[in-house]
Interface confidence: medium
Amino acid sequence: LRLLDHRALVCSQPGLNCTVKNSTCLDDSWIHPRNLTPSSPKDLQIQLHFAHTQQGDLFPVAHIEWTLQTDASILYLEGAELSVLQLNTNERLCVRFEFLSKLRHHHRRWRFTFSHFVVDPDQEYEVTVHHLPKPIPDGDPNHQSKNFLVPDCEHARMKVTTPCMSSGSLWDPNITVETLEAHQLRVSFTLWNESTHYQILLTSFPHMENHSCFEHMHHIPAPRPEEFHQRSNVTLTLRNLKGCCRHQVQIQPFFSSCLNDCLRHSATVSCPEMPDTPEPIPDYMPLW
């Protein structure tokens, strides 16, 4: 988790002088509770936005937006803590909006936004906005949280972001798998425009199960430049086992930008359909 490398993060708007600061996610008001605390944020919205760094790289970011409730507690609102928790790693990153002037009611509802948390493809986050100061231990909570799922690199807009392109998202191998006689599969795919090796991993499963009954790995050496974008054909030998009939073919490239962690593409061959057995015709017709 990190912040987009923007020049200066701003949270000021007409009628409010505000600065964005790094936060330890442990605001001072936890340790020194205040008697009067503001109410919670209203209408917290999280959306996927895209932003360029100063170097021109494009990253997915969490666009966080919320409004204030129209009650007198805004007189005690000193700022907000924004927290993003990546759910699979428990990594957390926080920033703090520090209000340098007192808020006053005006004719429009106060609205705040922040779009500088960089998020990763295919990850889920919990976004929390805490109004500051935080409540006393038994006080009403004054935060709002929402979960936010970032699409993977198959998503059209995500595909062209720097992290997705670095993991090989622009490569479309267009895998075809053909079943041959004598327990073999012919796998065909399009090579990318990089002189790097690939590996094909074949995993076979019984008809209705997810425990593999066979695995095979085939290495494809780095193509020469004249072979870029050409089709590569490989014949794989299957295990001669009647029930081991559903095959997943996975192609893993080793592009220089992602090495062992490039996006893998896969295709599946289902077990052959069992012909429906016709109902037996009885020798006699019952009379009732």
């Epitope: 995993t203 066979f214 695995e215 095979h216 295990r239 062992n260």
Partner: nanobody, 115 residues
């Protein structure tokens, strides 16, 4: 999760032989394809050879005819017999299960071929 421990490396003269072993723990070994990789100083980790549970093998062009990969499913062990070694075979050799390729690697075993 599979744990892999490589052994058998050492210093050998050009033209000599070594046999590497890879001991695997974890129930996924028996049906899994296994592979050897190597990483020379300052270079990317490269594929060497692979073997599936039926004994089907596949080799990098640079080692074909000189290296032989084998496995013992009952002992959960894979081997790499390296003959006619050349100085360019000097590297740290690693074993892995291709389906776990992006996970943590073992320590590897150092093979040094002197001329």
């Amino acid at each position: 999760e599979v744990q892999l421990v490589e052994s058998g490396g050492g210093l050998v003269q050009a033209g000599g032989s070594l046999k590497l072993s890879c001991a695997a723990s974890g129930s996924t070994f028996r049906g899994a394809a296994m592979a050897w990789y190597r990483q020379a100083p300052g270079k990317q980790r490269d594929f060497v050879a692979t073997i599936d549970s039926l004994g089907n093998t596949n080799y990098a062009d640079s080692v074909k005819g000189r290296f032989t990969i084998s496995r013992d499913n009952t002992e959960n062990t894979m081997y790499l017999q390296m003959n006619s070694l050349k100085p360019e075979d000097t590297a740290v050799y690693y074993c892995n299960v291709p389906r776990f390729i992006s996970r943590a690697w073992g320590q590897g075993t150092q093979v040094t071929v002197s001329s």
